[in-house]
């Protein structure tokens, strides 16, 4: 069971300083950007990490969304990442749901995290190349210091 | 409780191949992945590779990538590792391991090699 | 790849003193590193992952420590069934690399 806490606006970046965002074609995608252009390129550059409360903590439970003209949250039905048209909902009765992250640091690096999927145990989202694109993955993956999987996440609140 | 029983020592000449089995007995969660070790006489223990028994994706340590294949039986919960073109350097005792992921009390994930075959002794020798 | 240098390589000492084993990696890992014993003709046995923390059923004696590079075990009051062969394994990147090992003898 998760229950909607309070939530906060973030940029996401990867650790070649990458930030995340959302194209045109809802898309979520790494782009090297200045400051500038990560505050021009706004709201697709802010995520909106809402926080749940875990029946059974596991971590920091989250779902990312973003409001461009709709609000979509990033979910990974059938391993496969991608924004939906949809709210967070307020609760979730269940243990695992597409939406819901669990945010952990990494041990020793407070500012860097890792996003491990609630659904599918072992399987993290990652920045991975596809031919000239940065893109959001969902990854399993078993070498925990690859850093693929590791994010920094910078309040705007 | 978890083990892991291997398949019997062997003798092999110089040049030839050798595969050994590794079956799951006892209840097992999904999410594990079989690993490799050996060990030489006398000497440490050295990682040879992997495989992840869900889409049978394998990592292998870069010495060993030309000579070696992991395979896993889904069917029969065994794995298997078989090395080729082998050398007296080989002889060594081959353990299976299972890699899992252990959590702290914050959930935060680890893996570690927990269950651990009795090894099985190679022997190469012409 | 990631090196692990383990030190001592061997190490004599008496039951109830306590013992410090080392391991040093070549490059950040976090906390992803394990500890194990051998025993002669045994598999390895899993003593603490995580960098510190205990598996289940091995006595609080033994305890683990260390982020990033350098890592330590330590055995407070050794036992004779302590005396064996501990290895350091990291886990954070392939290849997985194994520390040398440290005998530790009876002295």
């Known amino acids: 069971y998760f229950g909607k806490l309070e939530s906060k606006l973030s940029i996401i970046r990867n650790l070649n300083d990458q930030v995340l965002f959302i194209d045109q074609g809802n898309r979520p995608l790494f782009e090297d950007m200045t400051d500038s252009d990560c505050r021009d390129n706004a709201p697709r550059t802010i995520f909106i990490i809402n926080m749940y409360k875990d029946s059974q903590p596991r971590g920091m439970a989250v779902a990312i969304s973003v409001k461009c003209e709709k609000i979509s949250t990033l979910s990974c039905e059938n391993r496969i990442i991608s924004f939906k048209e949809m709210n967070p909902p307020d609760n979730i009765k269940d243990t695992k749901s597409d939406i819901i992250f669990f945010q952990r640091s990494v041990p020793g690096h407070d500012n860097k995290m890792q996003f491990e999927s609630s659904s599918y145990e072992g399987y993290f989202l990652a920045c991975e190349k596809e031919r000239d694109l940065y893109k959001l993955i969902l990854k399993k993956k078993d070498e925990l210091g690859d850093r693929s999987i590791m994010f920094t996440v910078q309040n705007e609140d | 409780q978890v083990q892991l029983v291997q398949s019997g020592a062997e003798v092999k000449k110089p040049g030839a191949s050798v595969k050994v089995s590794c079956k799951v007995s006892?209840?097992?969660?999904?999410?594990?992945?079989f690993h490799w070790v050996r060990q030489a006489p006398g000497k440490g223990l050295e990682w040879m590779g992997r495989?992840?028994?869900?889409?049978?994706?394998?990592k292998y340590a870069e010495r060993f990538k030309d000579r070696v294949t992991m395979t896993e039986d889904t069917s029969t919960d065994t794995a298997y590792m078989e090395l080729s073109s082998l050398r007296s350097e080989d002889t060594a005792v081959y353990y299976c391991?299972?890699?899992?992921?252990?959590?702290?009390?914050?959930?935060?994930?680890?893996?570690?090699?927990?269950?651990w075959g009795q090894g099985t002794l190679v022997t190469v020798s012409s | 790849d990631i090196q692990m240098t383990q030190s001592p390589s061997s190490v004599s000492a008496s039951v109830g003193d306590r013992v410090t084993i080392t391991c040093l990696a070549s490059e950040d890992i976090y906390t992803y590193l394990t500890w194990y014993q051998q025993k002669p003709g045994k598999a390895p046995k899993l003593l603490i992952y995580?960098?510190?923390k205990l598996q289940d059923g091995v006595p609080s004696r033994f305890s683990g420590s260390g982020s990033g590079t350098d890592f330590t075990l330590t055995i407070s009051s050794l036992q004779p069934e302590d005396f064996a062969t501990y290895y350091c394994l990291q886990g954070s990147k392939f290849p997985l690399t194994f520390g040398q090992g440290t005998k530790l003898e009876i002295k």
């Open positions: 391991t299972t890699w899992r992921i252990y959590r702290d009390s914050s959930g935060r994930p680890f893996y570690v090699m927990d269950a």
């Open positions: 006892g209840e097992i969660s999904t999410g594990y992945y």
């Open positions: 995580g960098a510190n």
């Open positions: 495989i992840d028994p869900e889409d049978d994706s394998t």
